[in-house]
C-alpha cells in the first residue's frame, strides 16, 4: 500500500499519519481506535446498484 503523501488512498482504505501508510478500513473492526479509522467512517460506502429498476 502506498504512503498517503504519495497518492490518495484507494477505495476501502484510509491514510494513517501514525504509520505513514494507507491502511485497509477492514482492519478497523479489530482495531477501531486506529487513527485512520476516522477516515474510514467519513468515507462514503461503495456504490450500491439496485437489482431492480
Amino acid at each position: 500500500e502506498q504512503a498517503p503523501g504519495t497518492a490518495p488512498c484507494s477505495r476501502g482504505s484510509s491514510a494513517s499519519a501514525d504509520l505513514d501508510k494507507c491502511m485497509d478500513c477492514a482492519s478497523c473492526r479489530a482495531r477501531p481506535h486506529s487513527d485512520f479509522c476516522l477516515g474510514c467512517a467519513a468515507a462514503p460506502p461503495a456504490p450500491f446498484r439496485l437489482l431492480w429498476p
Epitope: A17, L19, R31, S34, D35
Partner: antibody, heavy 123, light 111 residues
C-alpha cells in the same frame, strides 16, 4: 514472549558496507500492521530512527540517510536486515531494531527493542 | 523534520518528590483526535523502554507514578513520587510524520 536480537560485524573500515541482521521471535512480520524499525545511538548521545519495514514489504527511510540505506526482510526466517553503504566514523553507534505492532487501541510505537549491537567504523 | 527539544537536559530530584520533563515540538504533532507523542526510559547499557504512548497512555506494566500530558507542540512527562529505580535518561518521540524523531534526552538523577 517477544524478543529481538541484533547482530553485525562489530568493526569495519570507512567506505565499507555495514550489514546488520535483526532476528526476532514472538511475533510474525506477516501479521497486518506489523513492522520493524532500525534505530541507532552513538555512545553517550541521542536516538536516531533510520528505517522501517512493514508486513507487506513497504519501506520507509530517514531522508537524511536514504541514499545509503536498504532495509529488507525474510518473513519465513523472522529476520530483518539493514545495509548502510559508504560508512564513515560518524556511523559508529549502537544499532537497535525495534517492533511496531498493532493492538486493539491502534498501533504501538516501538514497544519491544533488541539489546543493540555495537558498530565501530575505524581505519 | 519535526525537532523535539527536551528540557531540562538533566535534573536531580529528591526521593519521593516530583520530576517534570518537558518536550517541545517544532510543529504540532497532534490532530483533532490524536497526539502522536511517546515517552521512553533508557538505563545505561540497556535499550529504551516504552513508558507512555500517544501522550498519556501508560504501557502495560509501567507504574502509575508515570504520567503524560500535553497536545500540539508541548508535552510533559511527570514522575511522582520518584523512586531510586527511576534514575535514567528519558526520551520523547513523535510519530506524526516521517521521519520519526526523538528528543535529545533528559537525564534524571535521584538525590
Amino acid at each position: 514472549q517477544v524478543s529481538l536480537k541484533e547482530s553485525g560485524p562489530g568493526i569495519l573500515q570507512p567506505s565499507q558496507t555495514l550489514s546488520l541482521t535483526c532476528s526476532f521471535s514472538g511475533f510474525s512480520l506477516s501479521t497486518s500492521g506489523m513492522g520493524v524499525s532500525w534505530i541507532r545511538q552513538p555512545s553517550g548521545k541521542g536516538l536516531e530512527w533510520l528505517a522501517h519495514i512493514y508486513w507487506d514489504d513497504d519501506k520507509r527511510y530517514n531522508p537524511s540517510l536514504k541514499s545509503r540505506l536498504t532495509i529488507s526482510k525474510d518473513t519465513s526466517r523472522n529476520q530483518v536486515f539493514l545495509k548502510i553503504t559508504s560508512v564513515d566514523t560518524a556511523d559508529t553507534a549502537t544499532y537497535y531494531c525495534a517492533r511496531r505492532g498493532p493492538d486493539y487501541y491502534g498501533y504501538y510505537p516501538m514497544d519491544y527493542w533488541g539489546q543493540g549491537t555495537s558498530v565501530t567504523v575505524s581505519s | 523534520d519535526i525537532v523535539l527539544t527536551q528540557s531540562p537536559a538533566s535534573l536531580a530530584v529528591s526521593l519521593g518528590q516530583r520530576a517534570t520533563i518537558s518536550c517541545r515540538a517544532s510543529k504540532s504533532v497532534s490532530t483533532s483526535s490524536y497526539s502522536y507523542m511517546h515517552w521512553y526510559q533508557q538505563k545505561p547499557g540497556q535499550p529504551p523502554k516504552l513508558l507512555i504512548k500517544y501522550t498519556s497512555n501508560l504501557e502495560s506494566g509501567v507504574p502509575a507514578r508515570f504520567s503524560g500530558s500535553g497536545s500540539g507542540t508541548d508535552f510533559i512527562l511527570n514522575i511522582h513520587p520518584v523512586e531510586e529505580e527511576d534514575a535514567a535518561t528519558y526520551y520523547c518521540q513523535h510519530s506524526r510524520e516521517l521521519p520519526w524523531t526523538f528528543g535529545g534526552g533528559t537525564k534524571l538523577e535521584i538525590k
